[in-house]
């Protein structure tokens, strides 16, 4: 059994930031969950990840540099990504797991998401470098 | 032959840190369906889970454990790990590996344990 | 977190008693029809090993003596006919929510 996920095929990103929204044929409500969103074609770079839990506010971080937050719906969950580069063009897949309660669950690879970053062109400092190209 | 052997445990200082291994057999822990779990025993008390790691690599931890703990694994060795740190006397304890399967996670699989005793 | 507490602590009993040992929780740990509470039986010197699962499902190479029932947050494991090698401690397991927790053990004696 997988979870399947919808995702907008194109987003474009005018301003350096934009709002993916994960749709999932499962409903997350007192579910514990691991949402997270993932870069290029081989998801290689996990870009944002929130941790759902019945009895816990909604943790959400990145360890690759990224601004995000998050929000829970029922079955979706909305990925809020900004400052974003324009070499951050990318595909961008929604991936989901479901822990407890068992059995375990996750989705059957999605089609992702294209999000074109238009707009101002954000230089990164010199001190603090954008992630570099892939 | 499903088998899981745990090793790296001995003295260690109060402050310090452990990190022990669990060789696994029998199954590969990036295939879907099963995963691996943590839990240890103080000398004469019950199990305490302090945490698991799935097929994907994501990982769950003990929220009393989780500021200190990691657990990773080397697919390429089919081993997982475990690093506990600023150890503290309250850590001694048995430590086993084991596995559990996605339909109802009961254990079914341990292996024999690691003693790791915390003591200056 | 979930409570799991067993009771009694400990008993003696004798080779070809029956033996029941009891498992609380202090909220249900039944989803969609199924009891995600298990059974290991340790002794000294060993890792715990799998006799129930999912309440009532005997693991694979235990004993039919074994068997558990129960739903929501009461459960017993019965022993039908004790035997000398099952003489040990016998602790439940609930996997219905994180953190996972076992209840503090019953210890069955010899009398």
């Known amino acids: 059994n997988k979870i399947l996920v919808k995702q907008s095929p194109m987003l474009v990103a005018y301003d350096n930031a934009v709002n993916l929204s994960c749709k999932y044929s499962y409903n997350l409500f007192s579910r514990e969950f691991r949402a997270s969103l993932h870069k290029g074609l081989d998801s290689a770079v996990e870009v944002c990840v929130v941790y759902g839990n019945y009895s816990q506010q909604l943790q959400v971080y990145s360890k690759t540099g990224f601004n995000c937050d998050g929000k829970l719906g029922n079955e979706s969950v909305t990925f809020y990504l900004q400052n974003l580069y324009v070499n951050q063009t990318d595909i961008y897949f929604c991936k989901i797991e479901v822990m407890y309660p068992p059995p375990y669950l996750d989705n059957e690879k999605s089609n992702g998401t294209i999000i074109h970053v238009k707009g101002k062109h954000l230089c990164p400092s010199p001190l603090f470098p954008g992630p570099s190209k892939p | 032959e499903v088998q899981l052997v745990e090793s790296g445990g001995g003295l260690v200082q109060p402050g310090g840190s452990l990190r022990l291994s669990c060789a696994a057999s029998g199954f590969s822990l990036s295939t879907s369906g099963v995963g691996v779990g943590w839990i240890r025993q103080a000398p004469g008390k019950g199990l305490e889970w302090i945490g698991e790691i799935y097929h994907s690599g994501s990982t769950y931890y003990n929220p009393s454990l989780k500021s200190r703990v990691t657990i990773s694994r080397d697919n390429s060795k089919n081993t997982l790990y475990l690093q506990l740190n600023s150890l503290r006397a309250e850590d001694t304890a048995v430590y086993y590996c084991?596995?559990?399967?996605?339909?109802?996670?009961?254990?079914?699989?341990w292996g024999q344990g690691t003693l790791v005793t915390v003591s200056s | 977190d979930i409570q799991l507490t067993q009771s009694p602590s400990s008993l003696s009993a004798s080779v070809g008693d029956r033996v029941t040992i009891t498992c609380r929780a202090s909220q249900s740990v039944d989803f969609h029809g199924i009891s995600f509470l298990h059974w290991y039986q340790q002794k000294p010197g060993k890792a715990p090993k799998l006799l129930i699962y999912?309440?009532?499902s005997l693991q694979s190479g235990v004993p039919s003596r074994f068997s558990g029932s129960g739903s929501g947050t009461d459960f017993t494991l019965t022993i039908s006919s004790l035997q000398p090698e099952d003489f040990a401690t016998y602790y439940c397991?609930?996997?219905?929510?994180?953190?996972?927790?076992f209840g503090q053990g019953t210890k069955v004696e010899i009398k």
């Open positions: 999912a309440a009532s």
């Open positions: 084991a596995r559990y399967k996605y339909d109802y996670y009961d254990f079914d699989y």
């Open positions: 397991q609930q996997s219905y929510r994180s953190p996972r927790t």
